[in-house]
């Protein structure tokens, strides 16, 4: 009766993501074979979270409804591991949005999750950000510096990455 | 007022290269981005790519990718557009345009037409 | 890429008719289009954007809905200036393709 009753929340809980998720890839957390974490097929995984690489090209607004759309919001990149495990999935001659805008061009930059902005956790190529008008982060490739981030005019339309919470079954 | 003037017509051999220009006034030319979009006569729209006048980002249509090349001069507020390896079917006029703070084309430069015939 | 069917590509109408023209995306495109008039000889005029929205100086007559794939672009009472071509464009992702036009001409 337990097992019915699991399995049947389980399903439900399925359904919910269906629209925008056919199909899952679950792993089994740890020895109790209860828990369950899942990302949509095939988005990768690292820690609690999902990741996309969109190759669409679109404005940093459009990317963001993009991601929203999905049940996700451009990734918040919390630590140095998360951004190593992040460009693993890139490709050097593009471009990526990330969840970090200036909307006032007064560089108080925000994360879209209302994460806190930690200058300590930022991970800027030199010399960036450097222009009140370029008002959105991506991450891209130096050969110099190799992966870090840059400031870029919100409307010039990049690849992105979206990221969401693990869905637990 | 806002202002996007374009450069005169042009008339080029196949395989030739041309560069149409697009001079901006009226407003903070590194602030906006510019389009570029043409029109073969009588026939209808096509987006060709977008440059960021600050800092020379581009991303252009994969259709003419390898032949467009668009760049811009900031100390003449100045945008262009060069596309090689021209070809008859490139016959068309040549719009830029800015793409104002909503992410529409709101204010457009009175094209160029490009001519290409042996 | 994102293609947009426009209907009907051409149309004859009079002085004071009520003129509608679609547009199809052949994706979501999450209400981000915009509407233009052109004229012989000139450059494309924003009429709306955001599927709905009228640019500044735009007469009332003008009006959008839609969404999803489907738009529509409505003029309530046609006058004799709106004889023109009408263009949709979307701006989901690049490229940002624009349907085939709708030719209005006076019947």
């Known amino acids: 009766n337990f097992m019915y009753s699991k399995t049947v929340k389980r399903l439900s809980k399925l359904r919910e993501y269906q629209q925008y998720h056919p199909s899952l890839t679950c792993v089994m957390e740890g020895k109790d074979i209860e828990d369950w974490s899942c990302c949509p097929t095939p988005w990768t995984s690292f820690q609690s979270s999902c990741y996309f690489i969109s190759t669409g090209m679109q404005s940093w607004t459009k990317s963001q409804k993009n991601c929203s759309v999905m049940g996700a919001d451009l990734v918040v990149i919390n630590t140095r591991e998360e951004q190593d495990f992040i460009i693993q999935n890139l490709k050097r001659n593009s471009s990526y949005f990330l969840g970090l805008s200036d909307p006032g061009g007064r560089r108080h930059w925000q994360w879209v999750d209302q994460t806190p902005y930690n200058e300590n956790v930022t991970f800027w190529h030199s010399g960036e950000p450097n222009n009140l008008d370029e008002r959105c982060a991506i991450i891209n490739f130096r050969s110099s510096e190799e992966w870090g981030w840059n400031d870029i005019h919100c409307h010039v339309p990049q690849k992105s990455i979206c990221k969401m919470k693990k869905i637990y079954i | 007022q806002v202002q996007l003037v374009q450069s005169g017509a042009e008339v080029k051999k196949p395989g030739a290269s041309v560069k149409v220009s697009c001079k901006a006034s009226?407003?903070?030319?590194?602030?906006?981005?510019i389009h570029w979009v043409r029109q073969a006569p009588g026939q209808g729209l096509e987006w060709m790519g977008t440059i960021y006048p600050g800092g020379g980002d581009t991303s252009y249509n994969q259709k003419f990718k390898g032949r467009v090349t668009m760049t811009r001069d900031t100390s003449t507020s100045t945008v262009y557009m060069e596309l090689s390896s021209l070809r008859s079917e490139d016959t068309a006029v040549y719009y830029c345009a800015r793409m104002g703070d909503n992410e529409y084309f709101d204010y457009w430069g009175q094209g160029t037409l490009v001519t290409v015939s042996s | 890429d994102i293609q947009m069917t426009q209907s009907p590509s051409s149309l004859s109408a009079s002085v004071g008719d009520r003129v509608t023209i679609t547009c199809r995306a052949s994706g979501n495109i999450h209400n981000y289009l915009a509407w233009y008039q052109q004229k012989p000889g000139k450059a494309p005029k924003l009429l709306l954007y955001d599927a709905e929205t009228l640019a500044d100086g735009v007469p009332s007559r003008f009006s959008g809905s839609g969404s999803g794939t489907d738009y529509t672009l409505t003029i309530s009472s046609l006058q004799p200036e709106d004889f023109a071509t009408y263009y949709c464009?979307?701006?989901?992702?690049?490229?940002?393709?624009f349907g085939g036009g709708t030719k209005v001409e006076i019947k």
């Open positions: 009226g407003y903070t030319f590194t602030s906006y981005i």
């Open positions: 464009q979307h701006f989901w992702s690049t490229p940002y393709t």
